[in-house]
């Protein structure tokens, strides 16, 4: 997250780490169920541990931290490697979550979004680009839903209606270790980060996020079939 | 099957702008899933990285160079450039142009596809 | 600027033997910010490994990455002819700079 700030302490109970040998954060993600979470469906890895109720980047012990493995990844059907539409995937937990102040799932919003909507993204992504830094703590930023036409003149040719738009201020933006997390919509889950301008935090270039009232059904669906 | 290939004169003066050309076939520059990037080789030595484009023409260049660097875009004819201003003996390289892979993830693909190169000579 | 040091500067083995290069960096870089590539006589680099540890498309399981922080090592399980070229690791983490190679020749 570029020129974001740290959260406060509880706040996203659903952001989840998605983790590499063994600590290195490399996406993040949402829980969305007792037993599953959503993801960028360019996040698939083989392998990987996921970390749940855990406010710091390091991996030092945190008492309301949980612990998991992925046992199933299904990316969307629509989704083809390395494009962006229909960038999502449903990760099964290896056991269902304990429920605390520190993890929670999160509901996701069956309306789409509409221009001038605020929402909370959030990540452990880097904090500046094109290098790479990393935040101590989790990092949450303030953006506005940009109208269909805005996103479209911003990256012409490559948007589509599995995605939205959203920023702020020039210097503001997710970024690199930001994918799969949640953008937030009036205590809803609207989005996950997809993608975006190259370096992040570019000027009338906004970050685009997956576009998640298009994919409730499927959700809920695939949810049910893999229980 | 995606093919980088670069074009440009073989010789450059010194003091004067080397222009280069990649042009991408088998595939696409307006893609929000690749960066573009430029690569040199002095004779007998190592890699040197000049600097990466997107498909919007947001640009990245290498510190020690930025100066004098100028890459562009020109999705219509599916191609990016380099410019390099006010060049030297030092100069003298084989360049390459490159493919690489971007997301928001925390994860670099590393340049994936690379053109077969072209030989850059500064010399009066 | 991170510099890459690469070792040893020429490595000379027989076909059939292992390889293991060494690339140590000047300060520490993520491992999901490492690669690896080939270059051949009169040819382009080829990538070989990225994220430290994960082979490119069509790469032999002969070639293999690993290491974090500093120190990166690529090891070649078995020198098929093919394999002697120059080898040359790549960071990301900050603006992307390259080793200095590491010559693998027939012994």
């Known amino acids: 997250i570029i020129n974001g700030s740290d959260c406060d302490m509880h706040t996203q109970p659903w952001q989840a780490a998605l983790l590499l040998r063994p600590n290195q954060l490399y996406c993040g993600a949402v829980l969305v169920h007792p037993q599953w979470l959503l993801t960028a469906a360019h996040c698939r890895k083989k392998v990987f541990r996921v970390r749940l109720g855990h406010y710091s980047l390091s991996p030092v012990y945190e008492s309301g931290q949980q612990m998991f493995q992925g046992v199933k990844s299904i990316p969307h059907p629509g989704y083809s490697h390395p494009g962006h539409s229909n960038d999502l995937m449903l990760i099964k937990l290896n056991r269902r979550i304990r429920p605390t102040k520190d993890v929670r799932p999160i509901n996701v919003s069956s309306h789409c979004p509409s221009a001038g909507t605020k929402c909370l993204v959030s990540g452990w992504g880097t904090t500046k680009s094109p290098q790479v830094h990393f935040p101590k703590v989790l990092q949450c930023l303030n953006i506005s839903v940009l109208s269909q036409k805005r996103c479209e003149d911003a990256y012409p040719r490559q948007i589509d209606d599995t995605m939205f738009c959203a920023g702020d201020k020039a210097g503001r933006d997710s970024c690199q270790g930001d994918s799969g997390g949640p953008v937030v919509c009036n205590g809803s889950l609207q989005g996950l980060v997809s993608w975006g301008d190259y370096p992040c935090a570019r000027p009338n270039r906004p970050g685009v996020y997956t576009n998640l009232c298009k994919f409730t059904k499927w959700i809920q669906e695939t949810i049910q079939a893999n229980s | 099957q995606l093919q980088l290939q670069e074009s440009g004169p073989g010789l450059v003066k010194p003091s004067e702008t080397l222009s280069l050309t990649c042009t991408v076939s088998?595939?696409?520059?307006?893609?929000?899933?690749?960066?573009w990037s430029w690569i040199r080789q002095p004779p007998g030595k190592g890699l040197e990285w000049i600097g990466n484009?997107?498909?919007?023409?947001?640009?990245y260049y290498n510190p020690s160079l930025k100066s004098r660097v100028t890459i562009s875009v020109d999705t219509s004819k599916n191609q990016f450039s380099l410019k390099l201003s006010s060049v030297t003996a030092a100069d003298t390289a084989v360049y390459y142009c490159?493919?690489?892979?971007?997301?928001?993830?925390?994860?670099?693909?590393?340049?994936?596809?690379w053109g077969q190169g072209t030989t850059v000579t500064v010399s009066s | 600027e991170i510099v890459l040091t690469q070792s040893p500067g020429t490595l000379s083995l027989s076909p059939g033997e292992r390889a293991t290069l060494s690339c140590r960096a000047s300060?520490?870089?993520?491992?999901?910010?490492l690669a690896w590539y080939q270059q051949k006589p009169g040819q382009a680099p080829r990538l070989l490994i990225y994220g430290a540890s994960s082979r490119a498309t069509g790469i032999p399981d002969r070639f293999s990455g690993s290491g974090s922080g500093t120190d990166f090592t690529l090891t070649i399980s078995r020198l098929e002819p093919e394999d002697f070229a120059v080898y040359y690791c790549?960071?990301?983490?900050?603006?992307?700079?390259f080793g200095g190679g590491t010559k693998v020749e027939i012994k």
């Open positions: 300060q520490s870089v993520s491992s999901s910010y």
């Open positions: 088998g595939g696409s520059i307006p893609s929000s899933s690749y960066y």
């Open positions: 484009i997107y498909y919007s023409g947001s640009t």
């Open positions: 490159a493919r690489g892979e971007y997301d928001r993830s925390y994860y670099y693909w590393g340049l994936d596809v």
């Open positions: 790549q960071q990301a983490f900050s603006s992307p700079t």
